[in-house]
């Protein structure tokens, strides 16, 4: 099959790369034979410092090749990305970054948790890989619902908070309103859609603190709302149905023992939050006294039935509905309850199965009279939401 | 024929992010090869910064990793480039390249002009 | 990285003249890995000289590369109106890719 002109003279024999191979292999190469480089698994071509799929040579007129053998180099995938509040760790060698090589990432103990083990791999694409084939590193998502608080203490009737009681609990400050949310995850806060409803088309004009019990402390983390979303079924000023809304913060927020979401219910938690099933609630909104609270207080009260609780509210507040999306908590004798101030908070349960504490409930309307006798509290029923609390965090 | 364009916003501030799109034409990004980009100072300076190859694996000018992202999208054959933080040093003629591999195979875009400034 | 320097900066000759230029390389670069673009004002850079010595496709053959190591040039034998441009060098043999501060050769 050789074209042997006389005009023409054969290229010199290719020598492969190491750690490559030639084909084909001919015993002389002439005017318009071609040869291929191929590298082992785990190594690239390259030509200088830039990467070839492939290459192919072509034997010129002139007795020369028409370019320069390739390097068969071994894969390197670079130094692994930063993991945001974790760490990387080289398993192989202190540095190695090459061919199967081996690296462990991990997440800040306590606060902060990965769902995979971790363990990546360099493969032979170049991209560090984990045993389920991901080539994103992973995340080390925030841990929720871990508190000190145990079971014990609008808010009437209640007591004072320590430090890491409530975590996940966010002061929402106005010009001229004071309200709450919960964190639920390090750049997400759950509330209620009328505390922000003013506030949608202002978001920035929402001053955001957390990682305090004392209301007027100087010494809060301070975060800023990039983006408020209200629940697409709340009508502002025609009853309570939908009290919800979610705030998206610019920046992510680092967790710690003071600042921590709280869970989210689980599909089982339903049969945590049934008829005298004890929650809690916290905030700095009216006290007994009729005064804001100037430490955070909480309350420990029980569910109530919902029909007793529908019932209530038909005969004191005519038109009034109490929905299948609102869930009551009080006593029947009264004395414990949430009031103004406290709206968008968090009526936690605690998970019996995780030890976690989950949201359960948002502040949301009640008796003018809080804490009266027969007038419950109104929260709205957070596990009828978490399809809209999922499809906002994944889609913004 | 290959060729490449750039687009992108010719102005941008003091401290935000630039983003630039090289939309490739009659060869394939992910076929073979490293996919740069390479700007051009007032000054005629010339600076390679960084490249996208045919896998997608990226490398960075040292001088630019802090703040530079290539990525690329296979189904509309095209690939980016994120500068982050960017300055009045930032302003450049911006051009999308694919450069000879020790063969005559060199493309390169016609330049997208780029001001920072408030 | 692999500094190119480029000399002279500016340089100006005669229709027919012969011109040298020099890219200097701070550390030694594969003749296979240095090119040389040709830039005129408004215009992308394009590719003019390939693997040290090799020419583009569409250069005239009055243009010549040369060189190895650290030391490498580009000649014309027989300057022309057209050739009036600005000349880089560029090396690709290690990372980062490092382009010459150009030469600008003016018509006398």
């Known amino acids: 099959h050789h074209h042997h002109h006389h005009a023409s003279r054969p290229c010199p024999d290719p020598t492969a790369p190491p750690n490559g191979s030639i084909s084909p292999v001919q015993a002389i190469y002439v005017l318009k034979d071609r040869f291929s480089v191929f590298c082992k698994t785990g190594f690239e071509l390259l030509q200088g410092s830039v990467p070839l799929k492939s290459f192919t040579a072509v034997c010129q007129k002139d007795g020369s090749w028409d370019r320069p053998m390739p390097e068969c180099s071994i894969i390197d995938c670079g130094p692994p990305d930063d993991l945001p509040n974790g760490h990387v760790d080289y398993i192989t060698g202190p540095e190695v970054t090459t061919y199967k090589a081996v690296i462990q990432y991990s997440c800040e103990e306590t606060f902060y948790t990965m769902s995979s083990n971790g363990k990546y791999v360099c493969e032979a694409d170049g991209f560090w890989t984990s045993s389920k084939g991901e080539k994103l590193p992973p995340v080390c998502e925030p841990v929720c619902g871990l508190s000190t608080h145990t079971i014990g203490g609008r808010i009437v009737g209640g007591q004072p908070a320590k430090p890491g009681d409530f975590p996940w609990q966010v002061l929402l400050l106005g010009q001229t309103t004071a309200a709450a949310g919960a964190l639920i995850h390090d750049n997400w806060v759950l509330t209620a859609a009328h505390a922000v409803y003013e506030k949608r088309m202002a978001a920035s004009s929402l001053n955001i603190r957390m990682g305090i019990l004392k209301r007027l402390s100087p010494h809060y983390t301070q975060a800023w709302p990039e983006e408020i979303f209200i629940h697409e079924g709340y009508t502002h000023g025609a009853g309570f149905d939908n009290d919800i809304a979610l705030i998206k913060l610019k920046n992510k927020v680092t967790i710690n023992g003071s600042i921590m979401p709280v869970c989210l219910p689980r599909k089982e938690a339903a049969s945590l939050m049934r008829t005298d099933f004890t929650g809690t609630v916290a905030g700095w909104g009216l006290t007994q006294k009729g005064l804001l609270a100037r430490n955070l207080m909480f309350v420990d009260i029980p569910i109530a039935d919902h029909q007793k609780c529908t019932a209530v509210y038909e005969k004191l507040y005519p038109g009034v509905r109490v929905s299948a999306n609102m869930l009551c908590a009080g006593l029947e004798t009264g004395g414990k309850d949430s009031c103004r101030g406290d709206a968008g908070g968090a009526l936690v349960f605690l998970d019996n199965e995780t030890q976690r504490w989950f949201v359960g409930g948002i502040v949301s309307w009640g008796s003018i009279n809080c804490g009266a006798a027969d007038q419950y509290g109104v929260y709205t029923k957070v596990i009828n939401y978490i399809p809209w609390i999922e499809n906002i965090i994944s889609n913004f | 024929d290959v060729q490449l364009q750039e687009s992108g916003p010719g102005l941008v501030r003091p401290s935000q992010s630039l983003s630039l799109t090289c939309t490739v034409t009659?060869?394939?990004?992910?076929?073979?090869?490293?996919w740069n980009w390479i700007r051009q100072f007032p000054g005629n300076k010339l600076e390679w910064m960084g490249y996208?190859?045919?896998?997608?694996?990226?490398s960075y000018n040292p001088s630019l990793k802090s703040r530079l992202s290539i990525t690329r999208d296979t189904s509309k054959n095209q690939f980016f480039l994120q500068l982050n933080s960017v300055s009045s040093a930032d302003t450049a003629t911006y051009y999308c390249?694919?450069?000879?591999?020790?063969?005559?195979?060199?493309?390169w875009g016609q330049g997208t002009t780029l001001t920072v400034s408030s | 990285q692999t500094v190119l320097t480029q000399s002279p900066a500016i340089m100006s000759a005669s229709l027919g003249e012969r011109v040298t230029m020099t890219c200097t390389a701070s550390?030694?670069?594969?003749?296979?890995?240095l090119l040389w673009y040709q830039q005129k004002p408004g215009s992308s850079p394009k590719l003019w000289i390939y693997s040290t010595s090799k020419l583009a496709s569409g250069v005239p053959v009055r243009f010549s590369g040369s060189g190895s190591g650290t030391s490498y040039s580009l000649t014309i034998s027989s300057m022309e109106a057209d050739d009036a441009a600005t000349y880089y060098c560029?090396?690709?043999?290690?990372?980062?890719?490092?382009f010459g501060a150009g030469t600008k050769l003016e018509l006398k």
């Open positions: 560029l090396q690709y043999n290690r990372s980062p890719l490092t």
């Open positions: 550390s030694s670069v594969s003749s296979s890995y």
């Open positions: 009659g060869y394939s990004i992910t076929s073979d090869y490293a």
């Open positions: 996208i190859s045919y896998s997608g694996r990226t």
């Open positions: 390249a694919i450069i000879s591999t020790a063969v005559d195979f060199d493309y």
